[in-house]
Interface confidence: low
Amino acid sequence: MATLEKLMKAFESLKSFQQQQQQQQQQQQQQQQQQQQQPPPPPPPPPPPQLPQPPPQAQPLLPQPQPPPPPPPPPPGPAVAEEPLHRPKKELSATKKDRVNHCLTICENIVAQSVRNSPEFQKLLGIAMELFLLCSDDAESDVRMVADECLNKVIKALMDSNLPRLQLELYKEIKKNGAPRSLRAALWRFAELAHLVRPQKCRPYLVNLLPCLTRTSKRPEESVQETLAAAVPKIMASFGNFANDNEIKVLLKAFIANLKSSSPTIRRTAAGSAVSICQHSRRTQYFYSWLLNVLLGLLV
């Protein structure tokens, strides 16, 4: 079978399975919520738009105020537990092998030269990344492990030729603010690649990432907060220089709020993130003083 056909077949099978899985999850959540007399969760947000292009060169790039970022999607329903909810084991394990094989097929073929030469390649790469990130939250640990390896392999193989697309797909997953494992998989990989974002894309990325980081800081899962705390220094080292004072304050306030958390992990990660935001801002000393004053105010 031609490489492209194999790829499309694997895409379709995996996509339809993941959609079934999501529907099952939603149904179970709805049942649980109805038992608790709660309204069902809102539908997932629509797929995010493409990142805005850098402003045309005739317009000032740095000092000018930027248009406000798009409003965040509606907040998710009650947070999903870190471990997936119990699902009928038999029904899922029957297709576990298929899902592993589909991931491997996509992985093998998306890096093949024949597919890379296809005019549809950018679109195919987008779908592949989306599916690997979806599978990072699969109920089966084997599928999760393979999806994780596939993400690493594809990023490594296509970094030189398709870095902007890879960065965009990871950003889209962060913006989605979905399942904890998928979010973490995207967050730490985006952070690793942040220093490779083209200089003129740094400001647009920053503007779009700020509401995402603020939203992620409100997630209750400790594992998400651990990943976020590891990602923030790398993201800010690349983009902090492009943030204005107000944007830095908004981000700092989000982490300061977490210092009141009952979880020691969330308090610790928030403190680390706040310090690295100050460290990588344009006015380091000013923000250290500002943060110190706010913290002293919390003690009074």
Epitope: L62, D160, S161, L163, V197, R198, P199, S238
Partner: antibody
Framework: EVQLVQSGAVMKKPGDSVRVSCRAS????????FTWVRQVPGQGLEWMGW????????NYVDSFQGRLTLTTDTSASTAYMELRSLRSDDTAIYYC??????????????WGQGTLVTVSS | QTVVTQEPTFSVSPGGTVTLTCALR?????????PSWFQQTPGQAPRTLIY???TRSSGVPARFSGSILGNKAALTIAGAQANDEADYYC??????????FGGGTKLTVL
């Protein structure tokens, strides 16, 4: 439009350091970024590194990492390039180029006249 | 280091149009690499013609234009003149803002 004036030609011995200056005639020095480029006589251009006068952020090409230091002095409206542990193959014309980062964060718009650095024992 | 390639030599007749290109040895050039073009005549400092793919530097005549052609960056000189005879260099900005120059093209106006 900004003009860049570089320091004069110098002779150095292997192992020495050289410091080349690049003075910018502008009232808004801190909005500029400076790129340093060198050209071995008869050869092509080689990108060395970049510095923002706004915040001192720098970017160095790996091959110069550890030997090259770029700095700016806002009060003197001057950018500096220091290259240490000179070798004979560092003999080249060193250019500074500037761009107003209000419009374009990285890049080269205006060039200095160049400074010939000769390294010979 | 990623290698940026240019045609070593090129010739054009006076009044003719010439397109010089700038390619990555591996991969395609897109506007995300913010290609810039420079002209250098013997004994002179380089002069910026184009930056960020197609933005002309101040004082550069409109007959110089930049674009992306297929998988390469391109500099087109329309209505070539004798004083266009020079070396032309492109630079591409890699990740994190490191610039890499092409080897240059020696343009002859015959």
């Amino acid at each position: 439009e900004v003009q860049l004036v570089q320091s004069g030609a110098v002779m150095k011995k292997p192992g020495d350091s050289v410091r080349v200056s690049c003075r910018a005639s502008t009232y808004s020095f801190s909005t500029y970024s400076f790129t340093w480029v060198r050209q071995v006589p008869g050869q092509g251009l080689e990108w060395m590194g970049w510095i923002s006068a706004y915040n001192g952020h720098t970017n160095y090409v790996d091959s110069f990492q550890g030997r090259l230091t770029l700095t700016t002095d806002t009060s003197a409206s001057t950018a500096y390039m220091e290259l240490r542990s000179l070798r004979s193959d560092d003999t080249a014309i060193y250019y500074c180029a500037a761009v107003d980062t209000t419009y374009y964060y990285y890049g080269m718009d205006v060039w200095g006249q160049g400074t010939l650095v000769t390294v010979s024992s | 280091q990623t290698v940026v390639t240019q045609e070593p030599t090129f010739s054009v007749s006076p009044g003719g149009t010439v397109t010089l290109t700038c390619a990555l040895r591996f991969g395609s050039v897109s506007s995300s690499y913010y290609p810039s073009w420079f002209q250098q005549t013997p004994g002179q400092a380089p002069r910026t013609l184009i930056y960020s793919t197609n933005t002309r530097s101040s004082g550069v005549p409109a007959r110089f234009s930049g674009s992306i052609l297929g998988n390469k960056a391109a500099l087109t000189i329309a209505g070539a003149q004798a004083n266009d005879e020079a070396d032309y260099y492109c630079v591409l900005y890699m990740g994190s803002g490191i610039g890499v120059f092409g080897g240059g093209t020696k343009l002859t106006v015959l």
